[in-house]
Interface confidence: medium
């Protein structure tokens, strides 16, 4: 990969009620069909129009699903993960990882080897430093007046 995509990562608990046509989304991933290099996690690949997930509005395509009803999705075969969702019952609790892209570059996936994306302090420290420099420069300028 020539470059990378950086992410701010947040986690959320999403409780869905199974609708007439189910939960209303598709997944990719699993130990037998890694969707992201070096990451066998389960990702939301499609959200069906007017399905339970779409109507709830919080689950997004590209989200990583960490657990279903408290059951970890790590190291599962794709079909085993699918079966877990299908047998999850009427009320389904999903632990989800959202990734907000914060910097564009040549596209590359970030896998479990570096799961946290870009740490928040990596963004805040430069911003804070710039603010301090600007404040110092402003004070110096005022003293010269």
């Amino acid at each position: 990969m020539n470059g990378r995509v950086d992410y701010l990562v947040t986690e959320e608990e999403i409780n869905l009620t199974r609708g007439p046509s189910g939960l209303g989304f598709n997944i990719v991933g699993g130990t037998d069909q890694q969707y992201v290099s070096n990451d066998s996690g389960i990702y939301v690949s499609r959200i069906k129009e007017n399905g339970a997930a779409a109507l709830d509005g919080r689950l997004q395509e590209g989200d990583k699903i960490l657990s279903v009803n408290g059951q970890d999705l790590k190291n599962l075969l794709h079909q085993d993960a699918v079966d877990l969702f299908r047998n999850a019952g009427y009320a389904v609790s999903l632990r989800v990882q959202h990734r907000l892209q914060v910097q564009n570059g040549p596209i590359g996936h970030r896998g479990e080897g570096d799961p946290s994306g870009i740490p928040i302090f990596m963004v805040l420290v430069p911003v804070f430093a710039l603010t301090m420099v600007a404040a110092w420069a402003f004070m110096r300028y005022r003293q010269q007046l």
Partner: nanobody, 127 residues
């Protein structure tokens, strides 16, 4: 996007066999259903057979017991083995794919309008 390239069509005598192949440009892991449709001049395109990522298969009544659909994820290819061919099987055969992984709900029936990607078609003529 996924490009689909069909091959294997041709002219065959009644009672003969052909094997159609459809190669996808992207991994089949990201495709949740693939199908073969056929169309004859002046008629609507009709479903011949389909296979889901879960391995479920469905066939048109007219081809049951004669045609077999299968997929090879390693080669990103779906096949249609056609045996005991009849003159009425003459048509242009199209490969179709539905993107987006596997439904967490079921291997639901996939209608023609739900397919995202289509091949250019391959002619099968049974004399």
């Amino acid at each position: 996007d996924v490009q689909l390239v069909e091959s294997g069509g041709g002219l065959v005598q009644a009672g003969g066999s052909l094997r159609l192949s459809c190669a996808a440009s992207r991994t089949l892991f990201s495709i949740n259903a693939m199908a073969w449709y056929r169309q004859t001049p002046g008629k609507q395109r009709e479903l011949v057979a389909r296979v889901t990522s879960g391995g479920s298969t469905n066939y048109a009544d007219s081809v049951k017991g004669r045609f077999t659909i299968s997929r090879d994820n390693a080669k990103n290819t779906v096949y249609l083995q056609m045996n005991s061919l009849k003159p009425e099987d003459t048509a242009v055969y199209y490969c179709a794919a539905r993107g987006g992984g596997t439904s967490v709900d079921s291997d639901y029936d996939v209608e023609e309008f739900e397919y995202d990607y289509w091949g250019q078609g391959t002619q099968v003529t049974v004399s």
